[in-house]
């Protein structure tokens, strides 16, 4: 939930030309959805995993990183069609023979249960109910994430009316 903005104590009539600082806000950019402390963007188009990774970078974000089962469930609750799939920021590292998040950390065995092969060129996607591995060349939707940002808005009191 976004924090509510407290009532302004400024006397608007007496300070009509004065610029006032608004309280700090935790904001997601337009079109992004706030989920806990993250902003998520669900793509409307499809791409292979690498292109999805690159697209998130251009948006100053990353492919979704999921910390635990609770976060997985919260994200899956936003997927409204059982058949639709979204790439996340997890793929198989052949050199380390393990699932690796794009931030460099490895998948902990109790984080996510992945259905499918753990092999070269395997990337992970989520659906409404499950987590799967698939060839990274498969073209699917994807989810970008960015951390909530503090926005300090300087606005004229007129704009509050």
């Amino acid at each position: 939930q976004k924090p509510s903005i407290g009532k302004c104590s400024v006397d608007i009539q007496q300070n009509r030309t004065k610029t006032t600082e608004r309280p700090d806000l935790l904001n997601c950019p337009i079109y992004w959805q706030q989920v806990q402390e993250k902003c998520l963007l669900f793509s409307h188009t499809v791409n292979p995993w690498n292109n999805s990774l690159a697209d998130c970078s251009t948006k100053e974000s990353s492919l979704l990183l999921i910390q635990d089962k609770d976060e997985l469930t919260r994200t899956q609750n936003l997927i409204h069609d059982k058949a639709i799939s979204f790439w996340i920021g997890l793929n198989f590292s052949l050199s380390e023979k393990n699932w690796k998040w794009i931030n460099g950390s490895f998948l902990s065995s109790n984080d996510l249960k992945i259905t499918g092969d753990a092999k070269e060129n395997s990337c992970v996607y989520i659906s409404q109910t499950s987590v799967y591995s698939e060839y990274c060349s498969t073209e699917m939707k994807w989810i970008c994430q960015k951390e909530l940002t503090l926005v300090r808005n300087k606005v004229s009191p007129d704009s509050w009316l």
Epitope: T45, V46, P48, K82, A83, I84, S85, F86, T115, G116, Y125, S130, Y132, E134, Y135, S137, T138, E139, M140, K141
Partner: antibody
Framework: QVQLVESGGGLVKPGGSLRLSCAAS????????MSWIRQAPGKGLEWVSY????????AYADSVKGRFTISRDNAKNSLYLQMNSLRAEDTAVYYC???????????????WGRGTLVTVSS | DIQLTQSPSSVSASVGDRVTITCRAS??????LAWYQQKPGKAPKLLIY???SLQSGVPSRFSGSGSGTDFTLTISSLQPEDFATYYC??????????FGGGTKVEIK
């Protein structure tokens, strides 16, 4: 109007070639996996081939591998099937079909053309 | 390749009847299954995807269930326009995407 329209079917001799086309309209063609599915007279359905939205990934049924080639032109909203070395058992109605968007290679065919008949006979 | 066996191959029923068609996969396919309806001379129409999700525009008298190897399509109250042939299809991520042999629903 969202639709698929196949063309290019006809009568061809064994060993001959044919090129089928499928014109898509009413949706963003470049975002969908597309397939060819066929149905021999009085028989069931057989998936033939698919192509990914960008055209980078392609797959074929064993029965047509090495003889058929699927392709697409996203600028023209068109899907193609080049059929070479045709056999009598390739005789069928050939359907162009779109998959539900964003299901990856889990191909649920939610939009079909009316089909075009290919007859291979001497 | 994964084989799909549909039963029965044909069924005679009357308007208002409850009709059940089964589809059995030769190996587990999770919920990667679709059901189609086909009328003579027409293209198939997607009814159910992901084993139980109703495709947009399909009447609610159609329902799907099952996972793993055993799946069911149910028509709760058969209507005149439902007389057709029904096919199941497995859609695991690797081809070939096989179809069942079909079940013809005929008027009794």
């Amino acid at each position: 109007q969202v639709q698929l329209v196949e063309s290019g079917g006809g009568l061809v001799k064994p060993g001959g070639s044919l090129r089928l086309s499928c014109a898509a309209s009413g949706f963003t063609f470049s975002q969908y996996y597309m397939s060819w599915i066929r149905q021999a007279p009085g028989k069931g359905l057989e998936w033939v081939s698919y192509i990914s939205p960008s055209g980078a990934t392609i797959a074929y049924a064993d029965s047509v591998k090495g003889r058929f080639t699927i392709s697409r032109d996203n600028a023209k909203n068109s899907l193609y099937l080049q059929m070479n070395s045709l056999r009598a058992e390739d005789t069928a109605v050939y359907y162009c079909a779109r998959s539900l968007m964003a299901t990856g290679t889990h191909l649920y065919f939610d939009l079909w053309g009316r089909g075009t008949l290919v007859t291979v006979s001497s | 390749d994964i084989q799909l066996t549909q039963s029965p191959s044909s069924v005679s029923a009357s308007v208002g009847d409850r009709v059940t068609i089964t589809c059995r996969a030769s190996q587990g396919i999770s919920s990667w299954l679709a059901w189609y309806q086909q009328k003579p001379g027409k293209a198939p129409k997607l009814l159910i995807y992901a084993a139980e999700s109703l495709q947009s525009g399909v009447p609610s008298r159609f329902s799907g269930s099952g996972s793993g190897t055993d799946f069911t399509l149910t028509i709760s109250s058969l209507q005149p326009e439902d007389f057709a042939t029904y096919y199941c299809q497995q859609v695991t991520s690797q081809p070939p995407y096989t179809f069942g042999g079909g079940t013809k629903v005929e008027i009794k």
